[in-house]
Every structure is written in C-alpha cells, then in structure tokens.
C-alpha cells in the first residue's frame, strides 16, 4: 500500500509531545482541499516512545537518536512515501524540559540540539523542537478539544458527535494533567480579567474568544508526589515515612538526593540526618487528602478569587473536558462515567486506598508496580486539585467530562499546536463552496 495513488489529496502532519514522563508521536491527516474547515483533521496514529521523558536523557544524549527511532520509523510506514517531504514534523517539550531549563539552560539546549539533529535525519519536513510555554500548552489543549467537539463550526447539527456534545456553541473548558504541570483553560462569564498574565484573546472562524488560562508548574501528578514526600519527610522522626497515600503493606526506599533533584521540592529542602528513607504505606484516603491539601497555599490571594498559590481564577463556567492524566488515572480507577457523582468517587477512593498492597498486586497483575503503587496518590491528588484547587463542587462535578479521545483523536495540546503552526484555524469563517461539507453533515 506504500506507494498506491491516493484517491484524494490527503495531507499529513506529525507532532511529538515531549512530556516529563514520556514522549508520544501523533500523526494527523486531513483532506487538502478542506484544510480550513473545522473538524476535518483527525489522528491516524499515536506511537508512544519507549523510555522516559527527554529531560532524563541529559546524561546520555547519545541515546536520544535510538530512543526516537521506532516511532519515527512507524511514521515512515504510516505516511505514504510520496508525502514524506511535505509532511511537517514539530516537537514541543513541556514542563519536564521547563524544569530542566530552570536548572540549566545549557543542559536543556543540549538535549534539544540532539533531538533536532536526530529528527532532521528523517525524510520529513522538520520544523524544529522547542519548549512550549505553559500558556501555549493550556491554549492548544483548549483549541484541540473544542475543534474536535465541533464548537468552532457555525453549522447546527441535528445529531451529536459524542455523548457529551450539546448542540450549542458554548466552548468546553480544558483541564490537562501531566507529570510535571497541570493546566486549566476556559472562557469565563466575565470578559474583563484581573490578571493579564492569564488572559488570551483569539479570533477563530469569525468569532472572538476571551480565554482564561494558567499552567501550574510542579503540580503535575509526579512532581506533586515529590513535593508531598519532601514536605512530609521534614517532620518524620526517623528514616521511615508512614504514608497514607500508599496501600497498606507497600514499602519503597527513596534516595534523598532524588527527592531534592527537582526545583519543585526546593521550598521543602533541608539537611536530613539520613541519605535514604523508606515509605511505608498505611492506605488512608482522608489523611492522604489532608497531606495533599498542604501543597496548595490558599491563605494568600491578591485578587477577588484565586485557585491556589495566589493565582487568579475566575468563577468556573460551563462544561470541562479533563484529559491526559486526569483521564488515564480516573479510567484506571473506573471513575470516568458521567453517572458517578463526586461523593461516589470519594467513596471509591477511600475503598481503593485502603486495600492491602498484596491484594492490589494480585488484582492488577498486568500493571507495572511503579504505576500501580501511585494510583491511590494520583486519584486523591486529582480530587484535591479539582475540588480544593480549582473549586469544583459536588454539584459542578457533573460538568467535568473525563475524556481520552474525541472522534478517535487524543485530547491534548498537540492537535491545536499543529493546527496553529500550519495555519489551519482561520480567523474568519471560510466561505463554504457548494457541497464542501457534504461528507460530514
């Protein structure tokens, strides 16, 4: 099938999401003559790169080429050879690399330089690798989900594409959770903002959007766990940390040097009388929740309303799509159903966290222990972040939709990023040519 003539002119694009815990490659395709229409671009492939995030390759940059090979070769197979040279490739690095750059611009540059050299060796049209800002990450995630939900389309459908799609043109807010940061982006009711840093203005398909966005660096699930451990070990009487966020019977040794490696734990750093400590799980949701809440400073707010850490947050408005780790964790815990109330989620979390580690390992034999051990913390963290961090309530919980894919495309910032860089989101509504939309309405 590699070199068969295509029945219609199809274009392709590749985006690599270089996250803090892993890298994923996404391949998108669309009909060339409809590239300014809304909703025509869709994902044809996701390839998860084997190994950690690129920021972990700082000590072994010579391995980056091999690390990227499998997924880049997969792209070579999926995209017809005749299209290779005109297929753009973009790599966006997120919070893991922001943290590395905070420690050392030289090391971040070195990693990106090697990544760029590696990606330039492929027959595609490589457009560069860069660290995207938290604001971009939030904005492009918001664009992605609303594009896929058809919110930018001016046509009124008589049917819904997805269960939670309403026929109105009200956009969805975007809640994104990664390993090192989390983003909240939505259109608030009040157009005026108290914090210009959190304000974005777009004109898309002939309509103006005043969007609020904020990226909380260090509040992704992995860095939040490091923060919690660094905070809790401060008051431990010896090198044993009895931790309510891990299952009863769970044990793990942590190196203090690993704990203080990240800038995220800087505020909790202290000289400890030991080089290692042992986490001993006690599996108590309520205590875990209390410990997590201590990561959110809600005592200081220079605005009318804040999320936490003095960051402005306008009143929540409308429905929200919660994706990436919000979805992965809640899906694992079987809590993504629209019918599950916030009270029920809390109840299930209490039950899950209190289950003995040996029992959990038996029940989920196919899951890597490193990931399996952290679901109690991650689930508790998600609840705390949404309820106490972002001020969702038991009532507004029903406005959160945990989304993995929409129409076969992953929810996340990559599609929005590519749409923007390929100029596929026009500011004005394109003039419809006869039958141009016949294929999908």
């Amino acid at each position: 099938t590699q070199n068969k003539a295509l029945p219609e002119n199809i274009k392709y694009g590749i985006v690599l999401d270089a996250g803090s815990s892993h890298t994923s490659l996404y391949i998108y395709k669309w009909p060339a003559e409809k590239e300014n229409d809304t909703g025509v671009v869709h994902q044809v492939e996701e390839c998860r790169v084997k190994g950690p995030g690129i920021s972990k390759y700082v000590q072994k940059v010579n391995e980056i080429g091999i690390y990227l090979t499998d997924c880049m070769e997969r792209a070579r197979e999926v995209i017809p050879r005749s299209q290779h040279q005109e297929t753009p490739v973009y790599l966006g690095a997120t919070a893991g690399m922001r943290l590395l750059r905070m420690e050392s611009e030289e090391l971040a540059d070195r990693v990106l330089d090697v990544v760029e050299r590696s990606l330039s060796n492929y027959p595609f049209d490589f457009q560069g690798a860069r660290i995207i800002t938290g604001q971009e990450e939030g904005a492009y995630g918001w664009i992605t989900i609303n594009y896929l939900l058809g919110k930018f389309s001016q046509k009124t459908r008589w049917f819904s594409i997805v269960p939670y799609e309403t026929n109105n043109q009200e956009t969805f807010g975007a809640l994104d959770l990664g390993g090192a940061s989390t983003q909240i982006t939505f259109v608030p009711q009040n157009q005026t903002t108290e914090s210009p840093d959190n304000a974005l203005q777009f004109r898309l398909y002939g309509k103006d959007y005043n969007v609020y966005t904020h990226s909380f660096l260090c509040y992704g699930k992995d860095q939040a766990l490091w923060q919690k451990l660094a905070k809790d070990i401060q008051v431990a009487s010896n090198e044993i940390l009895r931790d309510p966020c891990f299952h009863p019977g769970y044990k793990k040794v942590v190196n203090v040097s690993d704990l203080y490696k990240t800038p995220c734990t800087k505020r909790f750093e202290m000289t400890l009388p030991f080089q290692q400590f042992e986490i001993q799980g006690i599996g108590n949701y309520q205590q875990c929740h209390q410990s997590v809440l201590e990561l959110f400073n809600t005592s200081y707010c220079p605005y009318s309303q804040c999320a936490f850490n003095g960051i402005f947050l306008p009143p929540l408005q409308g429905d929200f799509g919660a994706f990436s780790a919000f979805y992965f964790v809640m899906n694992f815990l079987n809590l993504t159903s629209e019918k599950v109330s916030q009270e029920k989620v809390t109840e299930m979390m209490k039950k899950f966290c209190s289950q003995p580690w040996e029992e959990i390992k038996t029940s989920y034999a196919g899951v890597k222990e490193k990931y399996l051990s952290e679901y109690c913390f991650s689930g508790t963290y998600i609840l705390s972040l949404l309820l106490q961090g972002y001020h969702f309530t038991a009532d507004s919980w029903e406005h959160i939709h945990f989304i993995g894919k929409i129409q076969g495309s992953d929810a996340g910032w990559t599609l929005g990023y590519m749409l923007n860089l390929t100029n596929m989101i026009p500011a004005e509504q394109p003039l419809s040519t006869p039958l141009s939309h016949s294929t999908y309405v």
Partner: antibody, heavy 116, light 111 residues
Framework: EVQLQQSGPELVKPGASVKMSCKAS????????MHWVKQSHGRTLEWIGY????????TFNQKFKGRATLTVNTSSRTAYMELRSLTSEDSAAYYC?????????WGQGTLVTVSA | DIVLTQSPASLAVSLGQRATISCRAS??????????MYWFQQKPGQPPNLLIY???NQGSGVPARFRGSGSGTDFSLNIHPMEADDTAMYFC?????????FGGGTKLEIK
C-alpha cells in the same frame, strides 16, 4: 523583550537593613530562577544566591547565608533581597540576574552605600 | 569553592589586533558534556553583558569577533579584530556548582 527593573539607590546606616526589588517583565516569571550578585569597587563580582520564584525556595553562598533573605511576589512579578546587619563592607552595587546557569539578563543594579 | 584565576589583570591592545584573556579554574567546570563557563563584558555604570555561554557559544547579538574556547579547567576569550568599543572590563564565571564564582576581571584598553 525581557527586562529586569531594579529599585533606586539606598543610603543606610551601619547595623541597619536594606530591602531592594527587581521587577521582571517579558517572560514567564516562574519559569526562571532569579540570582543576586554583589559588585564592590567596580571590580569584584560575588554571587549571593538565587530564589526559585515558582515556590520561594532559595540557595545561598555560605558567605551571605543568614544575613540575606530572598523573596518573591509572583502576582507583581517582583523579586526582593533584604540584607541585614550592614557594615561598610556591604557598600556595593547589587544586581539581579535571570537564569538557571546562564545569566543572560541583568537588572541595572541598585547602589547601596553604608555610612554613619 | 571553585576558584577562577583570570589573567592578565589588565591588557592594552592596538586597534585591529587580537586580545586574549584566559581563565583557569581550580577544578573542572565540565558536566554532562557541557562546560559551565561564561564570559561577560562590563562597561562603566552598566551591568555585566553576557558574551559567551557554555565556553564557546555566542550570546544573543554578540559580534562574531568575540570567540570563546576551552574545556575542563582552561578557557580563553579572544577578541579579534579589536575595536574601540571593546574597551571594558571582562569577567569569566562558572556555574557548575554552588557557590557560583567569578574571575577577578581583566581591564582591556586600547594601546
């Protein structure tokens, strides 16, 4: 365009304290550390320490530890340095500089004169 | 602490000629394949201005006549051809480990 705007000159008495500011613009304030550097006699440069604006954690040159305090106000994108128990040895220009390991952007400096 | 010894303390060079300033570290400032060595130019009444980072990379907007080289413990800054505007103080700095340290400075003048 990245800019660091520092507060004006200070004339202080020995034994007193001084608090200077550094207002940042043109970048995401919490994405970079803020360093402070002392320059005396127009020649000797000494690194005082840095703060992580993201969470307020700081690291100091042992020489200044206990006498210097670094703080930030993220909503106003401003970093502060307070120096206590001043002596004539502290008369110098003090600079803030943005960076992890690369000090690519510097404030214009705050001149501190300690005199009875 | 890593001590940086800069030499010479002062230097006078004719216009169009080459100026070479050296900086020796008391221990290697290399880590993960990167040299954490920097060169700054400072003119009276101004803050230091980054010329070279990572031992040999030119800072933003820095003219090509400023070249940095070296690795490990021995580094140098070369200015060629020397121009009148290059009269200034020059400092080396290491950020491999805390406390970050600076060299004593070199005063460069026109002969």
């Amino acid at each position: 365009e990245v800019q660091l705007q520092q507060s004006g000159p200070e004339l202080v008495k020995p034994g007193a304290s001084v608090k200077m500011s550094c207002k940042a613009s043109g970048y995401t304030f919490t994405d970079y550390n803020m360093h402070w550097v002392k320059q005396s006699h127009g020649r000797t440069l000494e690194w005082i320490g840095y703060i992580v604006p993201l969470n307020g954690g700081s690291t100091f040159n042992q020489k200044f530890k206990g006498r210097a305090t670094l703080t930030v106000n993220t909503s106003s994108r401003t970093a502060y340095m307070e120096l206590r128990s001043l002596t004539s040895e502290d008369s110098a220009a003090y600079y803030c500089a943005r960076g992890g390991t690369r000090f690519a952007y510097w404030g214009q400096g705050t001149l501190v004169t300690v005199s009875a | 602490d890593i001590v940086l010894t800069q030499s010479p303390a002062s230097l006078a060079v004719s216009l169009g000629q080459r100026a070479t300033i050296s900086c020796r570290a008391s221990e290697s400032v290399d880590n993960f394949g990167v040299s954490f060595m920097y060169w700054f130019q400072q003119k009276p009444g101004q803050p230091p201005n980054l010329l070279i980072y990572g031992a040999s990379n030119q800072g933003s907007g820095v003219p090509a006549r400023f070249r940095g080289s070296g690795s490990g413990t021995d580094f140098s800054l070369n200015i060629h051809p020397m121009e009148a505007d290059d009269t200034a103080m020059y400092f080396c700095q290491q950020t491999k480990e805390v406390p970050y340290t600076f060299g004593g400075g070199t005063k460069l003048e026109i002969k």
